[in-house]
Interface confidence: medium
């Protein structure tokens, strides 16, 4: 059946139109041809004029920007509330993982606090910026503990006698202790767990962030004039004819949308290919991989690196009192 | 072995409960994070008919409009959608995405590639370079324990990782030690997620 | 900086092929439309082919439709021309082309141009 | 197709004087957006073309204020206000409104 004659008085048009638009200056009072028209190209007389087909592309655009945030609403609202949690859980996974081996030091060995407080309050500190992004090597941090820790271990419990600060000899320490690998393979052992369980939180957190940074990208699009264009045509240009309950067709809102949106669903494939890329990253978060059981478990592995140099205390002293004898002379006289 | 430092818990029940069959810890926080991203997989191929499942469509009328006349729902001019003569479509076509999408294409194609640099091949529970130094994978049993450590007696067994609840946040009296450092925000007594995190506008 | 490298130009017999490659850098080429423009000894410019970002839409001069053909590898970063059947006429200078960028205007909109804002050195 | 007419086809100019070419379009340029969708390329000797203007009166980046485009619909004008000797080469209009995109013959 042919549809219906517009509106004689375009007095429909008028009354929607002026919800979009306050004052009706723009609307025609009776069918005009409407040869101006660019968007909403009329068959017959027309309640559009041109101001008016502006209006409405303005309208369908933030239409079109609505409906997208509204689609991503929950996503953006998983990821954002995800990022902030793990954010947070890691911070305190550090909080207690430094908690713990400042217990360890002051039940075990309380002659190398309060020292041990600060080295290992330095470590972790440390260790939370990089998680965060901070350009630190995990290997410089966990030599600068072993470095700093040796100079006390040594001064405070292997050969107490000697000056409270003797800053020559603990340069000669620091050196001595890597070149005598004084702690054996622990540092390595700590270096390699370390690194690669925050490396594996590091990149979880940026993957997360870039999540919420992919969604509002999307979140926050322009649309292209081709497509505030068909989106017009689509949604409002059936009012110029006076049709203002009709909805458009299933087929041809499809058609527009993917018209619309063929940039954005160039997304989709890296999108995939993101989640399930995050997917086998978090399969393998255990062990060695895990942040929260490796920096945890801290504590018993720097106990047990001290516990290896007090083992080998007797031959260590020997030998460091020869290679930092010239230090400790000048120190003493 | 190392002096576990139990007896620095201010709520010593949280020790007790430590041990609930199905707590909530961090790795299965990620794990259910990881199931409802799976949910939107899809989420940007299925974006153009989520819109128009959600703005007006002709479903139950007779006739719908195809951007030029009204015209029967299933006929053929509504299949051929008016687009007929009205611009070239293939204008859209010949276009990539817009500068910001290509943009975050390429951050995307980074990620994935460090994702993928960075996941751990599956079956491989412990490096290579680990057991060389004398951390066998034997070592440690079930799933419930982790051991982490090494040399003989000095191993340890910290039991089950963190709660992820608020019982979470405990906190030890060596946190106001003299020369420990407090950085941040160190009064958390409970997990919370009401801030943003990343580039929100 | 943006670069684009022809290569593959060569001396044939007529009614053979020659397939010529346009190596790019410096941008994202997926997100572009490319173009292949010849210009023949002392003559002008000529433009003989574009092809969408994605591969999917490809248009062609008269002279050319039916034996050449435009086609890109996104993961090479490469633009190609395969050249059937060729005649005397052919011989040119091939340049590859990048399409011009995107430009916002007043009211918001992004829209897309198709001038060709970057050129390679061309292959004989 | 759409056919580009240049004029003239050489033109012999001094250093510091202005120089002006003229190139007409079969059929309008002008989009429905009020854009004339026309560019201007020089190819300067033994080298490859380059952008100098676009949508009829834009400077692509790098362009010397001393270029300018004009004109609406099918009547377009390049002019250099001062040429210069580094300004030596061939001129073509091209349009870019549908295809086959279609160059002027060249102004040298």
């Known amino acids: 059946q042919p549809p219906p004659p517009p509106d004689a008085t375009c007095h429909q048009v008028r009354s929607f139109f002026q919800r979009l638009q306050p004052g009706l200056k723009w609307v025609p009072e009776t069918p005009v041809p409407g040869s101006d028209l660019q968007v909403c190209l009329p068959k017959g007389p027309t309640c559009c004029s041109r101001k008016m087909e502006e209006k409405y592309q303005l309208t369908a655009r933030l239409n079109m920007e609505q409906l997208l945030q509204s689609a991503s609403m929950e996503l953006k609202f998983l990821i954002i509330q995800n990022a902030a949690v793990f954010q947070e859980a890691f911070e305190i996974v550090v909080r207690h993982a430094k908690n713990y081996t400042n217990a360890m030091f002051k039940n075990n060995y309380p002659s190398l606090t309060p020292q041990a407080f600060e080295f290992v309050g330095e470590f972790f500190t440390d260790v939370s910026l990089y998680i965060l992004g901070s350009d630190i090597n995990v290997d410089d941090m966990v030599n600068e503990l072993f470095d700093s820790l040796f100079p006390v271990i040594y001064t405070q419990m292997m050969n107490p006698g000697l000056p409270e600060s003797v800053l020559d000899i603990n340069e000669c320490l620091r050196g001595a202790r890597r070149d005598l690998k004084v702690f054996g393979s622990f540092p390595k052992l700590i270096m390699t767990q370390v690194s690669k369980s925050l490396q594996v939180t590091r990149i979880f957190l940026q993957a997360l962030n870039l999540g919420i940074e992919v969604i509002n990208t999307t979140d926050h699009l322009k649309f292209s004039k081709d497509c505030g264009r068909m989106l017009t045509r689509m949604w409002y240009c059936s009012y110029c004819q006076g049709l203002m309950m009709v909805k458009p067709c299933g087929g041809y809102c499809n058609v527009v949308m993917q018209g619309c949106m063929a940039g954005v669903v160039e997304i989709d494939k890296y999108w995939r290919e993101y989640i399930l890329s995050l997917e086998e990253l978090v399969n393998g978060m255990y062990r060695i991989y895990d942040m929260e059981n490796v920096l945890l478990g801290l504590f018993s592995t720097i106990h047990d690196s001290i516990q290896y140099v007090q083992k080998n205390g007797g031959k260590l002293t020997t030998t460091i009192g020869k290679l930092c004898a010239h230090s400790q002379q000048r120190q003493y006289r | 072995s190392a002096y576990y430092p139990e007896d620095l818990f201010i709520d010593k029940k949280i020790l007790k409960v430590a041990h609930v069959e199905h707590e909530e810890t961090l790795s299965s926080r990620r794990r259910e994070l990881i199931q409802k991203l799976k949910s939107f997989i899809n989420f940007y191929s299925a974006l153009p008919g989520y819109i128009c499942s959600h703005s007006p469509v002709a479903e139950n009328d007779t006739l719908c409009w195809n951007g030029q006349e009204l015209v029967e729902r299933y006929s053929q001019k509504a299949a051929r959608n008016g687009m007929k003569n009205q611009f070239n479509l293939h204008e859209l076509k010949m276009k990539g995405p817009e500068p910001v999408v290509s943009q975050i294409i390429d951050k995307l194609k980074h990620i994935n590639q460090l994702l993928r640099t960075m996941s751990v091949p599956k079956g491989k529970v412990l490096d290579k370079s680990l057991d060389e130094e004398g951390l066998e994978s034997g070592d440690c049993g079930d799933d419930e324990d982790e051991c982490i450590g090494s040399s003989g007696d000095g191993m340890v067994k910290v039991k089950n990782q963190l709660r992820f609840l608020a019982e979470l946040a405990y906190d030890l009296d060596v946190d106001d030690a003299p020369g420990n450092k407090q950085h941040g925000n160190q009064k958390d007594n409970e997990i919370t997620t009401s801030h943003s995190v990343g580039n929100m506008p | 900086q943006v670069q684009l490298q022809e290569s593959g130009g060569g001396v044939v017999q007529p009614g053979r092929s020659l397939r010529l490659s346009c190596a790019a850098s410096?941008?994202?080429?997926?997100?572009?439309?490319m173009h292949w423009v010849r210009q023949a000894p002392g003559k002008g410019l000529e433009w003989v082919a574009v092809?969408?970002?994605?591969?999917?839409?490809?248009y062609y001069a008269d002279s050319v439709k039916g034996r050449f053909t435009i086609s890109r590898d996104n993961s090479k970063n490469t633009l190609y021309l395969q050249m059937n059947s060729l005649r005397a006429e052919d011989t040119a200078v091939y340049y590859c082309?990048?399409?011009?960028?995107?430009?916002?205007?007043?009211?918001?909109?992004?829209?897309?141009?198709?001038?060709?804002?970057?050129w390679g050195q061309g292959t004989t | 197709d759409v056919v580009m007419t240049q004029s003239p086809l050489s033109l012999p100019v001094t250093p510091g004087e202005p120089a002006s070419i003229s190139c007409r379009s079969s059929?309008?340029?002008?989009?429905?957006?009020?854009?004339?969708?026309l560019d201007w390329y020089v190819q300067k000797p033994g080298q490859s073309p380059q952008r100098l203007i676009y949508?009829?009166?834009i400077r692509a980046s790098g362009v010397p204020d001393r270029f300018s485009g004009s004109g609406s619909g099918t009547d377009f004008t390049l002019k250099i206000s001062r040429v210069e000797a580094d300004d030596v080469g061939v001129y073509y209009c091209?349009?870019?409104?549908?295809?086959?995109?279609?160059f002027g013959q060249g102004t040298k």
């Open positions: 059929q309008s340029l002008l989009d429905s957006d009020g854009y004339n969708f």
């Open positions: 091209m349009q870019a409104l549908q295809t086959p995109w279609t």
């Open positions: 410096g941008f994202t080429f997926s997100s572009y439309a």
């Open positions: 082309a990048k399409e011009g960028t995107y430009y916002y205007d007043s009211s918001g909109y992004w829209d897309y141009y198709y001038g060709m804002d970057v």
């Open positions: 949508l009829g009166s």
């Open positions: 092809i969408s970002y994605d591969g999917s839409n490809k």
